[in-house]
């Protein structure tokens, strides 16, 4: 058993039918010695008396808010949560496996630049009685500071019969140098509590590996005289690290017809302009990627050909 | 500790091309190592990230763009002094700081070159003959060093009398390649910045 926060405790259980569970001793936080009784949750049934209460925690029915009283007055509370270990592996019931970029990916994180700021998000089908708390650091043995905000519900979508809820959090490394070569990964730890179930999820990454630039901005077309060709131009996104000559991007320009089946023409360039043939009803899209370290491409910025 | 924004002559920067070749070569070699050594811990998540140049060179700090010198987090650097007779810039206006940066890059390349050559000698003794260093990568390191053209003492190749542990050697190869790829990215950024300056 360990303390998650004041008066909230996590009991780790080897989870299998007929498991013996864990013996837990609760102590009433009071100078009083006599006349103390214990109850669980809203029940008025007295579980025991005395300054300490010994319980065998086996299942969720044994978890909850234990309260010690004296003469009708509440003295203190202890909330017991359960953390299930199933055949040597901690349970992952609360969050959905996003399966990207690989199986058992519960937390996904992205950064728009090298400033040390990043966003993580996760998915669940649970709508109520759910709380998250996020901590982060650079490295784990001698951790350096990363400050995370509160996790917030960022999207809701319907998937088949189920509703899916997306939560996200923003974090900022306390002293980040954009040009630094990372040798210790960022660690992100999410504590999830659903009713009386506790779970924790972690992700470990280098900022360089989670970079995804914003799409190029100010995408414009300039028709070339006496030609079906157009000059496409764009600019680096505002959120990208500066100077751009040091943090350079490379670009992919795509001409896409109205039908998805039509052949796509693609051009790759390090410049912020390109000359392409504009077909009728087609659109021109441009996306960006770090020129020197192949992390994710940005989303497309698009303009119609007409 | 930073690169001043100079206005040298156009087309004066032969190192840019070499540094791009270097990044391509080390990235290809790392990919080959990951595939060939699939049953070894060779991915970024599995290896320890070691920097053989740590406390010996200070490329990131010496080559910091002027715009980032206002960022306090970028300035907690180590002090290192280098030889300053680089010829990568055709211009005579090479500042002391730029020379410091380029000589730091040269020292990095020299250190990695020695490590890779020593390692290749061990890998050639492996009866499995599973993986060797790409000669193209070694040649590209050499070309960039020549383009930087710094006079520096030659570091003798390390020789080891004891029987090599091939498993450990292959894991060390992965560690070295990951670190060298990261350094090659920094070198490419620096060359791009200098080329634009």
């Amino acid at each position: 058993i360990w303390e998650l926060k004041k008066d909230v405790y996590v009991v780790e259980l080897d989870w299998y039918p007929d498991a013996p569970g864990e013996m837990v001793v609760l102590t009433c936080d009071t100078p009083e010695e006599d006349g103390i009784t214990w109850t669980l949750d809203q029940s008025s049934e007295v579980l025991g008396s005395g300054k300490t209460l010994t319980i065998q925690v086996k299942e969720f029915g044994d978890a909850g808010q234990y309260t010690c009283h004296k003469g009708g007055e509440v003295l203190s509370h202890s909330l017991l949560l359960l953390h299930k270990k199933e055949d040597g592996i901690w349970s992952t019931d609360i969050l959905k496996d996003q399966k990207e970029p690989k199986n058992k990916t519960f937390l996904r994180c992205e950064a728009k630049n090298y400033s040390g700021r990043f966003t993580c998000w996760w998915l669940t089908t649970i709508s109520t009685d759910l709380t998250f708390s996020v901590k982060s650091s650079r490295g784990s043995s001698d951790p350096q500071g990363v400050t995370c905000g509160a996790a917030t519900l960022s999207a809701e979508r319907v998937r088949g019969d189920n509703k899916e809820y997306e939560y996200s959090v923003e974090c900022q490394e306390d002293s980040a140098c954009p040009a630094a070569e990372e040798s210790l990964p960022i660690e992100v730890m999410v504590d999830a509590v659903h009713k009386l179930k506790y779970e924790n999820y972690t992700s470990s990454f280098f900022i360089r590996d989670i970079i995804k630039p914003d799409p190029p901005k100010n995408l414009q077309l300039k028709p070339l005289k006496n030609s079906r060709q157009v000059e496409v131009s764009w600019e680096y996104p505002d959120t990208w690290s500066t100077p751009h000559s040091y943090f350079s991007l490379t670009f992919c320009v795509q001409v896409q017809g109205k039908s998805k089946r039509e052949k796509k023409d693609r051009v790759f360039t390090d410049k912020t302009s390109a000359t392409v043939i504009c077909r009728k009803n087609a659109s021109i899209s441009v996306r960006a990627q770090d020129r020197y370290y192949s992390s994710s491409w940005s989303e497309w910025a698009s303009v119609p050909c007409s | 500790r930073n690169l001043p924004v100079a206005t040298p002559d156009p087309g004066m920067f032969p190192c840019l091309h070499h540094s791009q070749n270097l990044l391509r070569a080390v990235s290809n070699m790392l990919q080959k190592a990951r595939q060939t050594l699939e049953f070894y811990p060779c991915t970024s998540e599995e290896i320890d990230h070691e920097d053989i140049t740590k406390d010996k060179t200070s490329t990131v700090e010496a080559c910091l763009p002027l715009e980032l010198t206002k960022n306090e987090s970028c300035l907690n650097s180590r002090e290192t002094s280098f030889i300053t007779n680089g010829s990568c810039l055709a211009s005579r206006k090479t500042s002391f700081m730029m020379a410091l940066c380029l000589s730091s890059i040269y020292e990095d390349l020299k250190m990695y070159q020695v490590e890779f050559k020593t390692m290749n000698a061990k890998l050639l003794m492996d009866p499995k003959r599973q993986i060797f260093l790409d000669q193209n990568m070694l040649a590209v390191i050499d070309e960039l060093m020549q383009a930087l053209n710094f006079n520096s003492e030659t570091v003798p190749q390390k020789s080891s009398l004891e029987e090599p542990d091939f498993y450990k050697t292959k894991i060390k190869l992965c560690i070295l390649l990951h670190a060298f790829r990261i350094r090659a990215v920094t070198i490419d950024r620096v060359m791009s910045y200098l080329n634009a300056s």
Epitope: P17, D18, A19, D87, T125 | F39
Partner: antibody
């Protein structure tokens, strides 16, 4: 005392269907994941399928994916394996078992696919 | 397809020490715990070892398990006639848990 009692096995022709049941008692069935495992005559153990405690996630071996469906009825404390498009190579003793570091196995039920 | 490899058979005389190996990879045994089962003819498998080296109550202490890197082994010190059975190791793959992997199985024969 944890008990898993299996039923539903038998002889079936190739291409036909069969449903196996596994009735659980002596524990809170709705709190635990469950597996199906099979063993062809004279062969080793082969994992078939798994279902989470609440039925929200199901996993299958590649050899049965698309043909077999694992399900559970927590109100009846029963686990099921619906087997469709049966093949000769599905002939085996099928076992249900609980998920956890200590597991409990059913007695097994024989499924024979033969024309 | 089996990813956990065991020798098809091992044998020993009563009182001898018999060991069975189970060879896997970094993503299964290297990342997860191992179980061992004993299966007597015509019966369901019985758990002998969980968590690499833990014995459930009721399992004789002549059975012991260990794990090193990507391999695991089961040892029977002082093998007895009633130990003649099939033995299976079991683990998970870190990317596909709870998909379960069983070893190929080993027939233990007690001679004479």
């Amino acid at each position: 005392q944890v008990q898993l009692v299996q039923s539903g096995g038998g002889v079936v022709q190739p291409g036909r269907s069969l449903r196996l049941s596994c009735a659980a008692s002596g524990f809170t069935f709705s709190s635990y994941g469950m597996h199906w495992v099979r063993q062809a005559p004279g062969k080793g153990l082969e994992w078939v399928a798994f279902i989470r405690y609440d039925g929200s996630n199901k996993y299958y071996a590649d050899s049965v994916k698309g043909r077999f469906t694992i399900s559970r009825d927590n109100s009846k404390n029963t686990l099921y394996l619906q087997m469709k498009s049966l093949r000769a190579e599905d002939t085996a003793v099928y076992y249900c078992k609980t998920h956890g570091s200590h597991d409990n196995w059913g007695q097994g039920t024989m499924v024979t696919v033969s024309s | 397809s089996y990813v956990l490899t065991q020798p098809p058979s091992v044998s020993g005389t009563p009182g001898q020490r018999v060991t069975i190996s189970c060879s896997g990879g970094r993503s299964n045994i290297g990342s997860n715990t191992v179980k061992w089962y004993q299966q007597l003819p015509g019966t369901a498998p019985k758990l002998l070892i969980y968590g690499n080296d833990q014995r459930p109550s009721g399992v004789p202490d002549r059975f012991s398990g260990s794990k090193s890197g990507t391999s695991a082994s089961l040892a029977i010190t002082g093998v007895q006639a009633e130990d003649e059975a099939d033995y299976y190791c079991q683990s998970y793959d870190r990317g596909t848990h709870p998909l379960t992997m069983f070893g190929t199985g080993t027939k233990v024969t007690v001679l004479g």
